[in-house]
Interface confidence: low
């Protein structure tokens, strides 16, 4: 919504509209105003006022219709539990201050499910989950609980029994008013909550809830079998290879949105497309903007609608001015445009229609002011897709409607009515402003914390070194009276770090090996170091080769599972399903095809990560895998101890990749402390490890300072991971990496 601080163009005076303890800003070219309070405060009695045709602002009325003379900022408080079954809560207050706690305890014989202690947050919402006291014998379904602030009617939980929820006057119900106990022991719909007008979802909450719901739709994991009565079943869907997914992006372009918010919404959707592509799913996109009339920019039936880059290009080319002349808000017509894309000619359903999942993502600042109630179109869409008709197969998984309400004018009842309601999921979101929504989608694409996606980084100006290289591990081996060896490594799974074998000797004890990740000071406990069985540094001593680095790879197994986060995340390994998805290749991609994609017979742009003066920096190099490969490998003869070697293939085996030199560009070189670190190919915004740094021809890092000028024969050699895959596959078989 565009904020204008000029005098309203309407006829309402600004005299006397001030709010005590806060400020106001004008919306809709002065036809409305929003009161703004500091964090932890909310505008009382209303958040917005409209300029009436009489030339006066709408009156300040409380929820019980009393008129107030002057608006004020009041401290946010969280609602008290209306009732709590089979237990007690303390302290018992009428409402709770921000930061205040409420604790729940159960009567004898009942077990607490949910959060025993909940804290009131600055947005007026409680943290944690609904506390329920259950004795396990309630019925076919478990007790659905009473979310704080709601009232529940119904206490029978047999199959097909229903419970209904109500909110106190002045509060709006979000979620399902009625929930029914279903086959399998789950409750229909989504948990309700009572919302005050000042309550907004925080970007973190929205990102988490939206992502977790969206991934339920697109992750493609089997639902677990054997859910007994009362067990919560998570919605997990098998993406049938013959099935598909359509995502309809519907964007409000009415005049109340404003140009900058429209641009912001476009950014959000671009990030969403990127995010979905990163899962390896290739949905078809429909793209609609609307005001008085809808405009379809991309139809799902178009050949390129599944090309994420092309759809992004179309999205970027949309101009806010496109709806300038007809700038009402007709959400019904917009959804009818979506319906028209879903329906089929001559009403003859095409083959596979019932295996297509449909996701509608609607972004708006206020919803309809013309055209009638859009909920009727949602009902028509549900009819078309045969959703909710057959009790045995309700097909709810085939339609998800997400609604993002942005700004203070959002009608909570309307957006809640349109959004899908699914157990343990949230489909309706209300955010303060477009910047907040951009934050949501930024976090969503760059954090992806809900998934162990490999090779993802958080590229942001405020990110630390380990945000940008979250896989990077630092290794040091303490050897009494011999000083210590420093190496690098890469996190490849929750239990394993991949590094070079030469960093260790057979005498090194686990306790003398220090590994740290994520820039953390603490060292991780080591269970065991696994060497490649063919590694033997002394293997060719008799042949006059003092050190032989063939198969120079090792895996460090950690005692405790790593907790992935922004600064600790795995790198992608070749020939895994994760890499197939990262490169957005078809699911049928073979290991050989990945190799052709990552290591074609040419100069390949790659990078390694080095530590310079306590800072991690990326160094761009070229793997010589084409016509320069031979000369690169021949330069190994300049390495100390290799000058007598007649046939260089004695030391440079097929296991090595070669970088360095001055062509096509002058490559930076690795240093001793870089050994064991990953050699990485950066593709499609993802990072895939293709090698392990092993040895170099010239020590260009004397005295800890990198020399600027290095000879052309300064080459580096790295173990090619494609050449040690059987070993990696064997050792990492329990790590869920999905080796091809």
């Amino acid at each position: 919504t565009p904020w204008s601080l000029a005098r309203p163009q309407g006829s309402c005076s600004l005299e006397g509209v001030e709010i005590k303890g806060g400020s106001f800003r004008l919306l809709q070219e002065g036809q409305a105003l929003e009161y703004v309070c500091p964090s932890g405060f909310y505008p009382y009695p209303v958040q917005t006022r409209t300029c009436r045709s009489t030339g006066s602002w709408s009156t300040l009325k409380t929820q019980d219709q009393k008129t107030v003379r002057k608006a004020e900022c009041r401290a946010v408080r969280c609602p008290a539990p209306v009732s709590f079954e089979n237990g007690i809560y303390t302290p018992r207050l009428g409402s709770y201050p921000v930061g205040g706690n409420v604790s729940f305890e159960c009567e004898d014989g009942f077990i607490l499910r949910g959060s025993p202690v909940r804290q009131c947050r600055p947005n007026g919402m409680w943290d944690g989950e609904t506390a329920v006291c259950d004795n396990g014998g309630a019925g076919y379904c478990s007790n659905p609980g009473i979310p704080i602030g709601t009232r529940k009617v119904g206490s029978q939980y047999r199959l097909e029994d229903s419970v209904t929820y109500h909110c106190s006057r002045g509060l709006t119900l979000r979620g399902s008013q009625r929930r029914t106990c279903q086959e399998g022991g789950s409750w229909s719909g989504t948990e309700p909550s009572c919302q005050d007008s000042f309550m907004y979802d925080t970007p973190q909450e929205v990102a988490e809830a939206f992502l977790s719901s969206l991934t339920e739709t697109i992750e493609g994991v089997d639902a677990e079998d054997g859910h007994g009565p009362g067990e919560q079943q998570k919605r997990k869907i098998v993406l049938d290879p013959s099935g598909s997914m359509n995502i309809y992006l519907v964007l409000d372009g009415s005049d109340s949105i404003g140009a900058s918010n429209f641009t912001g919404a476009k950014k959000c959707l671009v990030n969403l497309i990127e995010k979905v592509a990163s899962y390896g799913v290739k949905p078809r996109y429909g793209l609609v903007t609307y005001a008085t009339y809808p405009k379809i920019w991309v139809k799902v039936s178009e050949a390129d609608s599944s090309n994420a880059d092309w759809v992004t290009k179309q999205l970027n080319e949309i101009n806010y001015e496109d709806h300038k002349l007809k700038s009402g808000t007709n959400t019904k017509k917009a959804l009818q445009a979506v319906y028209s894309m879903m329906s089929w000619p001559d009403d003859v359903p095409p083959e596979g229609w019932n295996r297509t999942r449909h996701v509608i993502i609607l972004m708006t600042d206020g919803l309809h002011n013309m055209g009638g109630d859009p909920i009727t179109v949602i009902d028509e869409i549900r009819d078309l897709l045969y959703i909710g008709k057959d009790r045995k197969n309700p097909r709810e998984d085939y339609l998800d409607v997400y609604v993002f309400g942005v700004g203070p004018l959002v009608n909570q009842v309307n957006i809640n009515a349109l959004a899908s309601k699914k157990d343990n999921e949230q489909h309706v979101f209300k955010v303060k402003d477009m910047e907040n929504l951009e934050d949501v989608f930024y976090q969503m694409i760059d954090e992806s914390q809900s998934l162990s996606l490999c090779g993802m980084v958080w590229e942001h100006r405020k990110g630390t070194d380990y945000h940008k290289q979250p896989w990077q591990a630092k290794i040091s081996v303490i050897r009494p009276s011999k000083g210590h060896e420093s190496c690098m490594g890469a996190v490849v799974s929750e239990y394993f770090v991949l590094t070079a074998a030469h960093c260790f000797t057979v005498d090194d004890k686990e306790h003398s090996i220090k590994v740290s990740v994520g820039g953390e000071k603490r060292d991780l406990e080591i269970e065991v170091v696994l060497f490649h069985p063919n590694y033997n540094i002394n293997g060719k001593k008799e042949a006059g080769i003092p050190e032989f680095y063939d198969y120079d790879v090792a895996l460090i197994k950690l005692k405790n599972k790593l907790k992935y986060g922004q600064t600790i995340r795995p790198i992608c390994l070749p020939c895994t399903e994760g890499t197939t998805r990262a490169l957005r290749l078809p699911p049928t991609t073979t290991c050989q095809q990945q190799k052709e994609e990552l290591l074609p017979a040419q100069d390949i742009k790659a990078l390694f990560v080095s530590e310079e003066e306590k800072k991690l920096t990326r160094k761009e190099v070229y793997i010589k895998n084409g016509d320069k490969k031979g000369s690169c490998e021949r330069d190994a003869q300049y390495a100390p101890g290799y000058d007598k070697v007649k046939d260089i293939s004695e030391v440079v085996t097929p296991r090595f990749l070669c970088t360095g030199g001055v062509s096509p560009y002058a490559d930076p070189n690795t240093c001793r402390g870089d050994s064991g670190g990953p050699l990485i190919v950066h593709k499609r915004s993802r990072f895939i490890q293709v090698g392990v740094i092993s040895w170099g021809v010239v020590d260009v890092c004397k005295n800890q300072k990198r020399q600027k000028q290095v000879p052309a024969h300064a080459r580096d050699f790295h173990i090619n991971l494609f050449q040690v895959l059987p070993w990696l596959k064997e050792k990492l078989q329990d790590e869920d990496l999905g080796f091809l």
Epitope: E435, D439, Q443, W458, G463, T464, K615
Partner: antibody, heavy 118, light 111 residues
């Protein structure tokens, strides 16, 4: 212990230049950005710019661009700020301040008073 | 540039009482989940001293009577129980993007 020690007070004529130094100790000089901030007598704080000592990259407040030059000498862990074409309104205390991981100014020099007077 | 406006310009508070200073930014200082707003204390003849970083984090060594709150564009520095040594000028500063800017300062006196 982190310390930033600045050069002594200077008196300059309008149109001249002044170069203030800031010697850092107690930490790795190249690890953190160094910022320059000034304060006229009885007035507030005004950010001039920052320099990354590792890459010697700079960011300036547009108001000072072209007049202020920030440099470092890594070998002696010292940052410099030179201000040219001085005018009387440049009379102020000039501070160097070291950024922390959160881009806040965690450590400050004691300040250098620069007086511009004819 | 992001203009930071502090209020009030000056205030006098009795010992042991609560003091509150506000800082409003013309543009949001929030990015990547953090609010890049910091608070400093300056006494005459001394350089400023960092009290609060990222809107609400107390710098180690700073007494816990100081606290910061806020998000986006509106921020508050609170001194819960004023001590004699807290008489000083307080500044907010953002580092969301270049150029970094300071508020005009709030002079806090003991009543």
């Amino acid at each position: 212990e982190v310390q930033l020690v600045q050069s002594g007070a200077e008196v300059k004529k309008p149109g001249a230049s002044v170069k203030v130094s800031c010697k850092a100790s107690g930490y790795t000089f190249t690890d953190y950005n160094m910022d320059w901030v000034r304060q006229a007598t009885g007035q507030g704080l005004e950010w001039i710019g920052d320099i990354n000592p590792n890459y010697e990259s700079t960011g300036y407040n547009q108001k000072f661009k072209g007049r202020a030059t920030m440099t470092v000498n890594k070998s002696i862990s010292t940052a410099y700020m030179e201000l040219s074409s001085l005018r009387s309104e440049d009379t102020a205390v000039y501070y160097c301040a070291r950024e922390d991981d959160h881009d806040a100014f965690a450590y400050w020099g004691q300040g250098t008073l620069v007086t511009v007077s004819s | 540039d992001n203009v930071l406006t502090q209020s009030p310009d000056s205030l006098a508070v009795s010992l042991g009482e609560r003091a509150t200073i506000s800082c409003r930014a013309s543009k949001s200082v929030r990015t990547s989940g953090y609010n890049y707003m910091h608070w400093y204390q300056q006494k005459p003849g001394q350089p400023p001293k960092l009290l609060i970083y990222l809107a609400s984090n107390l710098k180690s060594g700073v007494p816990d009577r100081f606290s910061g709150s806020g998000s986006g564009t509106d921020f508050t520095l609170t001194i819960s129980s004023l001590q004699a040594e807290d008489a000083a000028t307080y500044y907010c500063q953002h580092s969301r993007e270049l150029p970094y800017t300071f508020g005009q300062g709030t002079k806090l006196e003991i009543k």
